[in-house]
Interface confidence: medium
């Protein structure tokens, strides 16, 4: 029996269901009281999910996994892995045994896409040109890391005196949170774009200070 | 001196494959974004695919979407471009081209001399 | 037909000003800086201005660059034989998530 799953990385978003494909091809006269199929973690050979002794085993993880009864016979041992988390990401193997054996790794990758940023400005009041700002770009619940990158309002980016922190709150997404310092001209756009590598997403923010009343 | 040397062009059937090399030196390969640009005989320059600096990030030109594929080998300071299903319109000179921004694509400051690729029956 | 447009064809007399223009849109030039590159005949793209108006070194100081709102322009002073070639504006886009080329200036100089 040859085994066969997607090459590519399966994508999923946080709290979404994912499906990690995996085939073989049956025998004529193959019945499912002859499958053993299994889905194990790569990595730590923890049970997932198994289908033996002509019956569906059910999940031995989380209580979130699920095959498809009705297409197995037909040779899909496809693994339904639902409402998807942080933690789920990784290496799936899927093994199939009916006279011989064979088994492929499929890799989940999870995503969450990042909040469009808020932009806070230190001072806030009383601008000169001249003076020294801090602007903070802050943007939320996204996986994995974000990139961060600052550009002016002519589009030149920014790259003295930015601080980029990220912290992952209980569910494993990351808040980031960006701190640009720069010295104001007479007028300035300042931009910060929060990119998911994975999603490659891009969140946009900007702040502009004219010495008059600030837009965000 | 930074030197980016392109090599794998030729001629190929329409429907064919090519896999274009890029061998870089003179400077830390793995710290910058790279691209291949093409140049159509007597068109424009068209932005094909990059690739950041891990491999992890790639774009591609709608053109060539699910048909290329971009990736780098940072051990071997080679930067590749897997060409599959080719048509007639792919025939071009394929530049590599480094960036001068680490981690996105934003403006290529070295370029190599090309390496043509022809697709005809 | 290129995201950013750009005039065909451009001609001037040796020691005359001449200005390429780019216009783009709010996803590109708008949001990113502009860089411009120099093709000489039969060899590669060349580097020849980057963020909007800097020049890398050994590029001469005829060469300028500016930028405003989504459009952008490269002005060549003291036009010399030497300077013809084909020039390109780039930029990334932010919609498109890549990189887009103007579609090229043929500049030709004259006598």
């Known amino acids: 029996v040859e085994v066969q799953v997607s090459e590519d990385p399966v994508v999923a978003l946080v709290d979404t269901d994912a499906t990690l494909r995996c085939s073989f091809s049956p025998e004529p006269g193959f019945s499912l009281a002859q499958l053993n199929l299994i889905w194990q973690l790569t990595d730590t050979k923890q049970l997932v999910h198994s289908f033996t002794e002509g019956r569906d085993q059910g999940s031995a993880y989380s209580n979130r996994t699920a095959l498809f009864p009705d297409l197995l016979v037909q040779g899909n041992a496809s693994l339904r892995l639902q409402r998807v988390r942080v933690t789920d990401e990784g290496s799936y193997t899927c093994f199939v045994s009916i006279q011989d054996f064979d088994s492929a790794a499929v890799s989940l990758q999870v995503a969450a896409p990042y909040s469009k940023p808020s932009m806070t400005l230190e001072p806030n009041k009383d601008l000169r040109p001249g003076n020294m700002v801090t602007i903070t770009c802050s943007s939320y619940q996204g996986y994995p890391e974000a990139e961060v990158f600052w550009k002016d309002g002519q589009g030149v980016p920014l790259t003295g005196n930015v601080t980029t922190s990220q912290m992952a709150n209980e569910r494993g997404l990351f808040d980031v949170h960006s701190v640009l310092r720069v010295v104001l001209g007479a007028n300035g756009t300042y931009s910060c774009l929060v990119r998911n590598p994975v999603l490659q997403q891009d969140a946009h923010g900007s702040v502009t200070i004219t010495g008059q009343p600030l837009t965000f | 001196e930074v030197q980016l040397l392109e090599s794998g062009g030729g001629l190929v059937q329409p429907g064919g494959s090519l896999r274009l090399s890029c061998a870089a030196s003179?400077?830390?390969?793995?710290?910058?974004?790279m691209s291949w640009v093409r140049q159509a005989p007597g068109k424009g320059l068209e932005w094909v695919s990059g690739?950041?600096?891990?491999?992890?990030?790639?774009y591609y030109a709608d053109s060539v979407k699910g048909r290329f594929t971009i990736s780098r080998d940072n051990s071997k300071n080679t930067l590749y471009l897997q060409m599959n299903s080719l048509r007639a319109e792919d025939t071009a000179v394929y530049y590599c081209?480094?960036?001068?921004?680490?981690?996105?694509?934003?403006?290529?400051?070295?370029w190599g001399q090309g390496t043509l690729v022809t697709v005809s029956s | 037909q290129s995201v950013l447009t750009q005039p065909p064809s451009a001609s001037g007399t040796p020691g005359q000003r001449v200005t390429i223009s780019c216009s783009g849109s709010?996803?590109?030039?708008?949001?990113?800086?502009v860089t411009w590159y120099q093709q000489l005949p039969g060899t590669a793209p060349k580097l020849l201005i980057y963020?909007?108006?800097k020049r890398p070194s050994g590029v001469p100081d005829r060469f300028s660059g500016s930028k405003s709102g989504t459009s952008a322009s490269l002005a060549i002073s003291g036009l010399r034989s030497e300077d013809e070639a084909d020039y390109y504006c780039?930029?990334?886009?932010?919609?498109?998530?890549?990189?887009?080329f103007g579609g090229g200036t043929k500049l030709t100089v004259l006598g």
């Open positions: 780039g930029t990334w886009d932010d919609s498109l998530s890549g990189y887009v």
């Open positions: 003179g400077f830390t390969f793995s710290d910058y974004a």
């Open positions: 081209a480094k960036d001068a921004w680490i981690a996105r694509l934003l403006l290529f400051d070295y």
């Open positions: 963020y909007n108006n």
């Open positions: 709010s996803s590109n030039i708008g949001s990113n800086a």
């Open positions: 690739i950041s600096p891990g491999g992890s990030n790639t």
